[in-house]
Amino acid sequence: IWELKKDVYVVELDWYPDAPGEMVVLTCDTPEEDGITWTLDQSSEVLGSGKTLTIQVKEFGDAGQYTCHKGGEVLSHSLLLLHKKEDGIWSTDILKDQKEPKNKTFLRCEAKNYSGRFTCWWLTTISTDLTFSVKSSRGSSDPQGVTCGAATLSAERVRGDNKEYEYSVECQEDSACPAAEESLPIEVMVDAVHKLKYENYTSSFFIRDIIKPDPPKNLQLKPLKNSRQVEVSWEYPDTWSTPHSYFSLTFCVQVQGKSKREKKDRVFTDKTSATVICRKNASISVRAQDRYYSSSWSEWASVPCS
Amino acid sequence: RNLPVATPDPGMFPCLHHSQNLLRAVSNMLQKARQTLEFYPCTSEEIDHEDITKDKTSTVEACLPLELTKNESCLNSRETSFITNGSCLASRKTSFMMALCLSSIYEDLKMYQVEFKTMNAKLLMDPKRQIFLDQNMLAVIDELMQALNFNSETVPQKSSLEEPDFYKTKIKLCILLHAFRIRAVTIDRVMSYLNAS
């Protein structure tokens, strides 16, 4: 058993049918010695008396808010949560496996640049009695500071019969140098509590591996005289790290017909312009990627050919 | 992928071109190592990230873009003295800071070159003959060093008398390649920046 926060405790249980559970001793936070009784949650049934209460915690019915009283007055509370260990592996009931980029990915994180700011998000089908708390650091043995905000509900989607809820959090490394070569990964730890169930999820990454630039901005077409060709031009996204000559991007320009089946013409360039043939009803899209470290491509920025 | 490159300053161009070749070569070598050594811990998540140049060179600091010198987190000032007669820069552009930066890059390349050559000698003794260093990568390191043209003492190739532990050698190869790829990215960024300024 360990303390999650003041008066909230997590009991770790080896979870299998007929498991013996864990013996837990609760102590009433009071100078009083006599006339103390204990109850669980809203029940008025007295579970025991005395300054300490010994209980055998086996399943969720044994978890909850234990309260010690004296003469009708509440003295203190202890909330017991359960953390299930199923065959040597901590349970992951609360969050959905996003399966990207690989199985057992519960937390996904992205950064728009090298400033040390990043966003993480996760999915759940649970809509109520759910709380999250996020901590982060650079490295784990001698951790350096990363400050995270509060997790917020960022999207709701309907998936088949189920509603899916997306939560996200923004974090910022306290003293980040965009040009630094990372040797210690960022660690992100999310505590999730659903009713009386506690779970924790972690992700470890280097900022360089989670970079996904914003799409190029100011995408424009300039028709070339007496030609079906157009000059496409764009600019680096505002959110990208500067100077751009150091943090260079490479670009992919795509001409896509109306039908998805039509052949796509693609050109790769390091410049912020390209000359392409504009077909009727086609659209021109441009996306960006770090020129030197191949992390994710940005989403496409698009303009119609007409 | 073949990407068109903007026409560079003629004085800077050789280094920019060679640094791009270097990044391509080390990335290919790392990919090959990860595939060949699939049963070894060779992915970024599994290895310890060690920098063999730590406390010996200070490339990131010495090559910091002017725009980032205002960022206090970037000024991890390590005093290191370097030889200052680089030939990559047209003389009108040579400044103390640039020379310091290029000299630091040269020292990095020299240290990695020695490590890789020592390691290759060990890998050639492996009866499994599982993996060797790409000669192209070693050649590209050499070409960039020549383009930088710094005079410095030759570092003797380390020779080891004890029987090599091939498992450890292959894991060290992965560690070295990951670190060298990251340094090659920095070198490419620096060359691109210097070329543009």
Partner: antibody, heavy 115, light 112 residues
Framework: QVQLVQSGGGVVQPGRSLRLSCAAS????????MHWVRQAPGKGLEWVAF????????YYADSVKGRFTISRDNSKNTLYLQMKSLRAEDTAVYYC????????WGQGTMVTVSS | SYVLTQPPSVSGTPGQRVTISCSGG????????VKWYQQLPGTAPKLLIY???QRPSGVPDRFSGSKSGTSASLAITGVQAEDEADYYC????????????FGTGTKVTVLG
């Protein structure tokens, strides 16, 4: 004590269907994940499928994906395996099993797929 | 498509020490715990070892398990006639959990 009693096995022709049941007693069935495991005659153990305690997630071996469906009825304390498009290679003893460090197995039920 | 490899058979005379190996990889035994089962002919498997080296109550102490890196082993010290059975190791793969990964199985024969 914990008990898992299996039923539903038998002889079936290729391409036909069969449903296996596993009745649980002696524990809070709705709190635990459950597996199906099979063993072809003279062969080793092969995992077939898993279902979470609340039925929210199901996982299958590639060899049965799209043909077998694992389900549970927590009000009846029963686990099921619906098997469709059966093949000769599905011939095996099928076991249900609880998930956890200490597990309990059903007695097994024989499924024979033969024309 | 077994990922955990066991020797097909091992044998020993009563009182001898018999060991069975179970070889896996970094993503299974390397990161997860190992169980061992005993299966007597015509019966369901019986748990012998969980958590690499833990014995459930009721399992004789002549059975012991261990794990090192990407391999595990089961030792029977002082093997007895009633130990003649098939033995399976089991673990999980970090990418496919909760799918159970079973070893190929080992037939233990007690001679004499």
């Amino acid at each position: 004590q914990v008990q898992l009693v299996q039923s539903g096995g038998g002889v079936v022709q290729p391409g036909r269907s069969l449903r296996l049941s596993c009745a649980a007693s002696g524990f809070t069935f709705s709190s635990y994940g459950m597996h199906w495991v099979r063993q072809a005659p003279g062969k080793g153990l092969e995992w077939v499928a898993f279902i979470r305690y609340d039925g929210s997630n199901k996982y299958y071996a590639d060899s049965v994906k799209g043909r077998f469906t694992i389900s549970r009825d927590n009000s009846k304390n029963t686990l099921y395996l619906q098997m469709k498009s059966l093949r000769a290679e599905d011939t095996a003893v099928y076991y249900c099993k609880t998930h956890g460090s200490h597990d309990n197995w059903g007695q097994g039920t024989m499924v024979t797929v033969s024309s | 498509s077994y990922v955990l490899t066991q020797p097909p058979s091992v044998s020993g005379t009563p009182g001898q020490r018999v060991t069975i190996s179970c070889s896996g990889g970094r993503s299974n035994i390397g990161t997860n715990t190992v169980k061992w089962y005993q299966q007597l002919p015509g019966t369901a498997p019986k748990l012998l070892i969980y958590g690499n080296d833990q014995r459930p109550s009721g399992v004789p102490d002549r059975f012991s398990g261990s794990k090192s890196g990407t391999s595990a082993s089961l030792a029977i010290t002082g093997v007895q006639a009633e130990d003649e059975a098939d033995y399976y190791c089991q673990s999980y793969d970090r990418g496919t959990h909760p799918a159970l990964l079973f070893g190929t199985g080992t037939k233990v024969t007690v001679l004499g």
